[in-house]
Interface confidence: low
């Protein structure tokens, strides 16, 4: 049996749950810390194209799998036309960014807005112009763009022609799309994210059917999709590393999402094993090949040998180290609905600090960007979102403790989200924006919520002052 404790993979994270003080890096007595974040801490905010852009077939945009899924699977949702209409109201988004005073804006490019059928030929001019204008405006404001290439809106044509991410043909097609984006936008983009939360793409897209394309119950498909997502990411990283990094001098990663979990019985070793299994089966599934030893976690290989694809030795070498930092998502999409298989009969927890400690121990203390964090409110809540403030304070406090007390190398934080918008399987029943948008209004004004004022103050003070 291969024991990899020295290199920091596969199992070290179990120490998080141990109540033996020699084992656990998190001191639970440190409840709140009045302190500042590191001097050049990177404060930002994010959106996903499908969630906020609207205009799903305007100006030559092709349909995505989510546009199709909305029409076929989600009841009482006509289309994302009812969203915040960022495609039309770009200036209003920029004013919202100005109001908060962020250092960066994380947004995603809609693949079918650039290439309506997914194949890289001549780009849709209006789509190209939209993203180019946005980037120019950000640069002008000294706001760093962090650009996600794929936030779930696969061109429908690729799903229908190839079966989407189930088909490894898509790896090269995705790489072509990435190459185009690097060529057109790389002069203004220093931070790239290939794929947003591939776990949810695979698990809910092909396992539960709760996400597009809505396929259900085929475990082999779930892990094939995961496999192709990892290989696509790796290919794009090598592409960027070889052909674009030398002159564009940027960084590239993949956003990996996870829940956190606590043992039913804190002194029970087997419950702790189950918690480890839970984290490994969600976060480790993608993190181990990319941030670890280049392969799936040992436990997954053993338990899922009949459905989990195999990486060849050459592929392991190729996968390993294909991220310039650890981009981590911690938000409601990984908690509700939680994969009960991943829950392992244990208790889910919103302890971001412990999740960060787990990453530190498992993956050799990487530099971490919190690439998505926040909670949600009911759609009836307008601008007085006190729950969101409470959650944000809690999460930010945990990040600060992780940095100051646990020496975890978090360099940036992405509040989620800039705007109220389309929230996937929850459609418009919840809100996650720091700015309120009345979806039924014509002008879609962005009204700062209490959380926007709160986040603005945090950024201004670079943390929590007494």
């Amino acid at each position: 049996i291969l024991l990899r404790a020295v290199t920091g993979f596969s199992g070290d994270g179990r120490a998080i749950w141990s109540k033996n003080p020699n084992f656990t890096p998190v001191n639970e007595s440190q409840l709140f810390l009045y302190d500042t974040f590191p001097k050049n801490f990177f404060w930002g905010i994010g959106t996903g194209a499908l969630q906020v852009e609207g205009s799903w077939k305007k100006d030559g945009k092709g349909p995505s799998i989510w546009d199709h899924f909305i029409h076929t699977h989600l009841k009482n949702v006509s289309s994302t036309n009812g969203s915040s209409d960022s495609y039309i109201f770009l200036e209003k988004d920029l004013s919202a960014l100005d109001f908060i005073g962020v250092s960066f804006y994380q947004f995603s490019i809609s693949w079918p807005r650039l290439f309506p059928d997914g194949i890289v030929t001549v780009a849709n001019a209006k789509g190209l112009q939209y993203y180019s204008t946005l980037l120019d405006a950000l640069v002008l404001r000294n706001i760093e763009p962090i650009v996600t290439l794929y936030h779930w809106d696969l061109p429908l044509a690729l799903q229908e022609k190839y079966g989407g991410w189930k088909n490894d043909t898509i790896i090269d097609i995705f790489n072509d799309y990435a190459t185009y984006c690097f060529q057109m936008f790389g002069d203004r983009v220093k931070y790239w994210i290939t794929i947003h939360n591939p776990y949810l793409v695979a698990w809910h897209g092909y396992g539960t059917g709760m996400h597009a394309p809505g396929e259900k119950g085929n475990l082999a498909a779930v892990y094939t999709v995961g496999h192709n997502l990892i290989k696509a990411h790796s290919k794009v990283w090598h592409n960027y590393n070889t052909h674009f990094r030398p002159h564009q001098k940027g960084w590239l990663s993949i956003t990996l999402g996870s829940h956190w979990i606590e043992p039913n019985r804190s002194e029970n070793t087997m419950d702790i094993f189950k918690c480890q299994q839970s984290m490994v089966s969600v976060l480790g599934w993608f993190a181990n090949p990319i941030h670890g030893d280049g392969d799936y976690p040992e436990g997954m290989r053993k338990k899922l040998f009949s459905v989990l694809p195999i990486f060849s030795e050459a592929e392991k070498h190729e996968m390993r180290g294909t991220a310039d930092f650890f981009a981590f998502s911690f938000g409601p999409n990984n908690f509700k609905p939680l994969n009960t298989m991943a829950k392992m009969g244990q208790n889910v927890s919103l302890n971001l600090r412990e999740a960060l400690n787990w990453i530190k121990l498992e993956y050799n203390n990487p530099r971490i960007l919190i690439a998505e964090n926040g909670w949600f409110t009911d759609s009836r809540v307008k601008t007085e979102d006190t729950t969101a403030i409470y959650m944000m304070k809690n999460f930010l406090s945990q990040v600060l403790q992780a940095i100051r007390l646990d020496e975890i190398r978090v360099f940036g934080y992405t509040a989620w989200s800039l705007l109220d918008g389309f929230e996937w399987q929850d459609a418009y029943t919840i809100r996650r924006g720091l700015f309120y948008v009345d979806f039924n209004s014509k002008q879609k004004e962005r009204k700062p919520k209490s959380s926007a004022h709160y986040y603005k103050q945090i950024i201004r003070e670079n943390g929590f002052s007494l």
């Epitope: 049996i1 596969s10 199992g11 094993f273 040992e298 997954m300 053993k302």
Partner: antibody, heavy 124, light 108 residues
Framework: QVTLKESGPVLVKPTETLTLTCTVS??????????VSWIRQPPGKALEWLAH???????SYSTSLKSRLTISKDTSKSQVVLIMTNMDPVDTATYYC????????????????WGQGTTVTVSS | SYVLTQPPSVSVAPGQTARITCGGN??????VHWYQQKPGQAPVLVVY???DRPSGIPERFSGSNSGNTATLTISRVEAGDEADYYC???????????FGGGTKLTVL
């Protein structure tokens, strides 16, 4: 090479306390993926698990014998000790210690290396 | 607590396939380990985690586990395979190791 060796008295009297020592080599009792179990086997009968100790010092005992058993480890000596009180002739058996392995950080993967066993007879 | 049930004995001719079962409530959701014990010797792990073989164990030994039954299969049985075989699980609810009652394999 991983080895475990049991040692202790060959003969104990009824009501006495049995102390068995398992000395390990080739691995550390501090290794987060290792644990040690004690198992016994009365003559001509099946294996019966007695107790287990994990690297973080967590212990687990057979329900039927819990009140009579204590397991502990001395990492510096690479030893695991089992104490069994109030011995009875029905406790006559071969006592084994075995290494338990956890792979992938969370799977209990059985007992991959066993000692050769020590035979204990309880008789007055 | 969790109970594992094994047949007391199984007989098979040399060269044939022996199948030793281990029954338990929803055992398919547990990891099952199998041990071989020859007379006067300590047990030896022959299959772990349902179907994995430790190094040095011949490929003739294989395992499967689903529903309420786990099975140890020994193909092309040899005289040297004659031994007692025990199945074992870790019962996560009680945090206990549980052994089956053992099966005596006789090679005819």
């Amino acid at each position: 090479q991983v080895t475990l060796k049991e040692s202790g008295p060959v003969l104990v009297k009824p009501t006495e306390t049995l102390t068995l020592t398992c000395t390990v080599s080739g691995f550390s009792l501090n290794n987060a993926r290792m644990g040690v179990s004690w198992i016994r086997q009365p003559p001509g009968k099946a294996l019966e698990w007695l107790a287990h100790i994990f690297s973080n010092d967590e212990k687990s005992y057979s329900t039927s014998l819990k009140s009579r058993l204590t397991i502990s480890k001395d990492t510096s000596k690479s030893q695991v000790v089992l104490i069994m009180t109030n011995m009875d002739p029905v406790d006559t058996a071969t006592y084994y210690c075995a290494r338990s392995v956890v792979t992938g950080g969370y799977y209990y993967d059985g007992m991959d290396v066993w000692g050769q066993g020590t035979t204990v007879t309880v008789s007055s | 607590s969790y109970v594992l049930t094994q047949p007391p004995s199984v007989s098979v001719a040399p060269g044939q396939t022996a199948r030793i079962t281990c029954g338990g409530n929803n055992i398919g959701s547990e990891s099952v380990h199998w041990y071989q014990q020859k007379p006067g010797q300590a047990p030896v792990l022959v299959v772990y985690d349902d179907s994995d073989r430790p190094s040095g164990i011949p490929e003739r030994f294989s395992g499967s586990n689903s529903g309420n039954t786990a099975t140890l299969t020994i193909s092309r049985v040899e005289a040297g395979d004659e031994a007692d075989y025990y199945c074992q699980v870790w019962d996560g609810n009680s945090d206990h190791v549980v052994f089956g009652g053992g099966t005596k394999l006789t090679v005819l």
